[in-house]
């Protein structure tokens, strides 16, 4: 399974990555976060490593992305799960895997699901198993909105920069 | 499975496709490549057919996309796999399917995985079988960077313009 | 399949295309539609509810999105399917699930598939089951073109705003 990250020095270099100065001076908020591979039983988003970044006002707060300015954003996320059968008798206990991007806004007193993907895995039938989930879409967001994720099956995540990520960019 | 092409006359018309020039004069590099359906045991990317295109500086070299100018790009790819059981005894030999978008840059002496999706298929259990993988994300890229793909399970690809593709656009 | 890329000369022509004088230079056509949850055995797209929207000239026509101005668009869609086994004997009847984004332009006498994803599910083996499909890519489209979807397995759709959607935005 791919687990190729960048060495610390390479990551440092990547953080100083050149930015395209377009002819017009409009800011283009964008963010790409990766799941911290050192946290095996949680999904902690990081922007200071590998290919991850926060640009033009995006910031991280309580494991959520903070929307820097009102507008339409394309929001996306991916997870990859893997596992083995628990035992020969495991066929009767399906494993529910799900990944969701949620919006928390001052407009609503709850987390609104924006993107949801789900899968039922039967580990006893298929050993080992692997499953990928990806989704993305355009949403009208307001400055200060919080974008977060919720995942069922976190212990089964394949945490690498290319398999588990979360991002957004202004259109 | 979709295999719908365009008639020669329609193809001729489509080649003269109008392009949107916005009020500001900035170029918007974009590319969409499709897997060559005439190459059954390899994945060769093409930009001169069907809905595929290279715009504003993108080019193909050694089956890789060359990044035309430094900046942030959304990079995406999809593959669809299909197959039948090998034999009644095939349940013991799982098939590993994977698709990865990789970056080769002068900064690093190796291919860095940007996007990875994986699946384990058990052909003996499910005959026939079909599986789709998609992924996409935003990355900071440098002029001259090479974007390529690596696929496990190439003989099982469903090669059509709407099922197997690879693209990128500048944000 | 017949070729519809831009030839060098056509690309040259396209670059000389006159600027579209929009009302202001910041128009960014975008649309995000959700499947109407009140229509259980059909997939009816709505833009006037929940997080859905039509912006800067996108419009609906006969359950299709109408392209507001010629240019390159990122087009995407997702569906989630779910189900239970029909009976203990259902293993012999696989369920074909598919979702496709199609382009209809009356220059062709058929719908051209742009994005296709497929899956074969064996309900007798896995009860209950869940499956997600997502795809998206960049396409050169013309003002007035119609983007629609075709789905196999509509009775199995999980119709919610975060699971079944269809959208596009101008690059």
């Amino acid at each position: 399974l791919p687990g190729v990250g960048l060495t610390p020095s390479a990551a440092q270099t990547a953080r100083q990555h050149p930015k395209m100065h377009l002819a017009h001076s409009t800011l283009k908020p964008a963010a790409h976060l990766i799941g911290d591979p050192s946290k095996q039983n949680s999904l902690l988003w990081r922007a200071n490593t590998d290919r991850a970044f926060l640009q033009d006002g995006f910031s991280l707060s309580n494991n959520s992305l903070l929307v820097p300015t009102s507008g339409i954003y394309f929001v996306y996320s991916q997870v990859v799960f893997s596992g083995k059968a628990y035992s020969p008798k495991a066929t009767s206990s399906p494993l529910y895997l799900a990944h969701e991007v949620q919006l928390f806004s001052s407009q609503y007193p709850f987390h609104v699901p924006l993107l949801s993907s789900q899968k039922m895995v039967y580990p006893g039938l298929q050993e080992p198993w692997l499953h990928s989930m990806y989704h993305g879409a355009a949403f009208q967001l307001t400055q200060g909105d919080q974008l977060s994720t919720h995942t069922d099956g976190i212990p089964h995540l394949v945490l690498s920069p290319s398999t588990v990520f979360f991002g957004a960019f202004a259109l | 499975l979709p295999g719908v092409g365009l008639t020669p006359s329609a193809a001729q018309t489509a080649r003269q496709h109008p392009k949107m020039h916005l009020a500001h004069s900035t170029l918007k590099p974009a590319a969409h490549l499709i897997g060559d359906p005439s190459k059954q045991n390899s994945l060769l990317w093409r930009a001169n057919t069907d809905r595929a295109f290279l715009q504003d500086g993108f080019s193909l070299s050694n089956n890789s996309l060359l990044v035309p100018t430094s900046g942030i790009y959304f990079v995406y790819s999809q593959v669809v796999f299909s197959g039948k059981a090998y034999s009644p005894k095939a349940t013991s030999s799982p098939l590993y399917l994977a698709h990865e978008v990789q970056l080769f840059s002068s900064q690093y002496p190796f291919h860095v995985p940007l996007l990875s999706s994986q699946k384990m298929v058990y052909p003996g259990l499910q005959e026939p079988w079909l599986h789709s993988m998609y992924h996409g994300a935003a990355f900071q890229l440098t002029q001259g960077d090479q974007l390529s793909t690596h696929t496990d399970g190439i003989p099982h690809l469903v090669l059509s313009p709407s099922t197997v593709f690879f693209g990128a656009f500048a944000l | 399949l017949p070729g519809v890329g831009l030839t060098p000369s056509a690309a040259q022509t396209a670059r000389q295309h006159p600027k579209m004088h929009l009302a202001h230079s910041t128009l960014k056509p975008a649309a995000h539609l959700i499947g109407d949850p009140s229509k259980q055995n059909s997939l009816l797209w709505r833009a006037n509810t929940d997080r859905a929207f039509l912006q800067d000239g996108f419009s609906l026509s006969n359950n299709s999105l109408l392209v507001p101005t010629s240019g390159i668009y990122f087009v995407y869609s997702q569906v989630v399917f779910s189900g239970k086994a029909y009976s203990p004997k259902a293993t012999s009847s696989p369920l074909y699930l598919a979702h496709e984004v199609q382009l209809f332009s009356s220059q062709y006498p058929f719908h051209v598939p742009l994005l296709s994803s497929q899956k074969m599910v064996y309900p007798g083996l896995q009860e209950p089951w869940l499956h997600s499909m997502y795809h998206g890519a960049a396409f050169q489209l013309t003002q007035g073109d119609q983007l629609s979807t075709h789905t196999d397995g509509i009775p199995h759709l999980v119709l919610s705003p975060s699971t079944v959607f269809f959208g596009a935005f101008a690059l």
Partner: antibody, heavy 118, light 107 residues
Framework: EVQLVESGGGLVQPGGSLRLSCAAS????????IHWVRQAPGKGLEWVGY????????NYNEKFKGRATISSDKSKNTAYLQMNSLRAEDTAVYYC???????????WGQGTLVTVSS | DIQMTQSPSSLSASVGDRVTITCRAS??????VAWYQQKPGKAPKLQIY???HRYTGVPSRFSGSGSGTDFTLTISSLQPEDFATYYC?????????FGQGTKVEIK
């Protein structure tokens, strides 16, 4: 400057046909659709349909499907509206219009009056 | 088809008056509404699109608002050249439909 000039209006017998022309200038003809909109005397506006000269794509108001045909000739920078089986209620000023974004009727011709009467 | 109902059908006002015209859609159309001005014997002119965006060259005294089913065109200070008939149009779904018009006359 964008200019649209309609022609072909006049008196038509009930059951007859008409073919209206819309000559376009001042922009690249194949970059935008041409809409046809009509207005009965003293009444409101009614969208008939559009044609894209680039690819001959069309979209019609269902009310006019089968009776109206919208086409264009790239070589002449001209769009056409053909209407068959005309009735008295088809009496109207017929306008062609060029949008900016598809559903926004930004540029209009001067209109041509069609009178259906015996 | 979506029906667009305008009110009032006509109104009398004086130069300098604030004028408000409303338009109601038979179903929610998001913010997909445009407004046109038409003078006798002339073609309509686009004033407002997407409920609240002024088209190029339209004076700032014209403004639009609303979303869902209820929309408003406001002329903050009526000028002599503003006396005309105004039409709303939904651009949410085809067939794009217009209101029956509101005639703004000199009092």
């Amino acid at each position: 400057e964008v200019q649209l000039v309609e022609s072909g209006g006049g008196l038509v017998q009930p059951g007859g046909s008409l073919r209206l022309s819309c000559a376009a200038s001042g922009y690249t003809f194949t970059s935008y659709v041409i809409h046809w909109v009509r207005q009965a005397p003293g009444k409101g506006l009614e969208w008939v349909g559009y044609n894209n000269p680039y690819n001959d794509g069309t979209n019609y108001n269902e009310k006019f499907k089968g009776r109206a045909t919208i086409s264009s000739d790239k070589s002449k920078n001209t769009a056409y509206l053909q209407m068959n089986s005309l009735r008295a209620e088809d009496t109207a000023v017929y306008y062609c219009s060029r949008p900016t974004m598809l559903p926004w009727f930004a540029y209009w011709g001067q209109g041509t009056l069609v009178t259906v009467s015996s | 088809d979506i029906q667009m109902t305008q009110s009032p059908s006509s109104l009398s006002a004086s130069v300098g008056d604030r004028v408000t015209i409303t338009c109601r859609a038979s179903q929610a159309v998001s913010s997909a509404v445009a407004w046109y001005q038409q003078k006798p014997g002339k073609a309509p002119k686009l004033q407002i699109y997407s409920a609240s965006h002024r088209y190029t060259g339209v004076p700032s005294r014209f403004s639009g608002s609303g979303s869902g089913t209820d929309f408003t065109l406001t002329i903050s200070s009526l000028q002599p050249e503003d006396f005309a008939t105004y039409y709303c149009q939904e651009h949410y779904s085809t067939p794009w439909t217009f209101g029956q018009g509101t005639k703004v006359e000199i009092k």
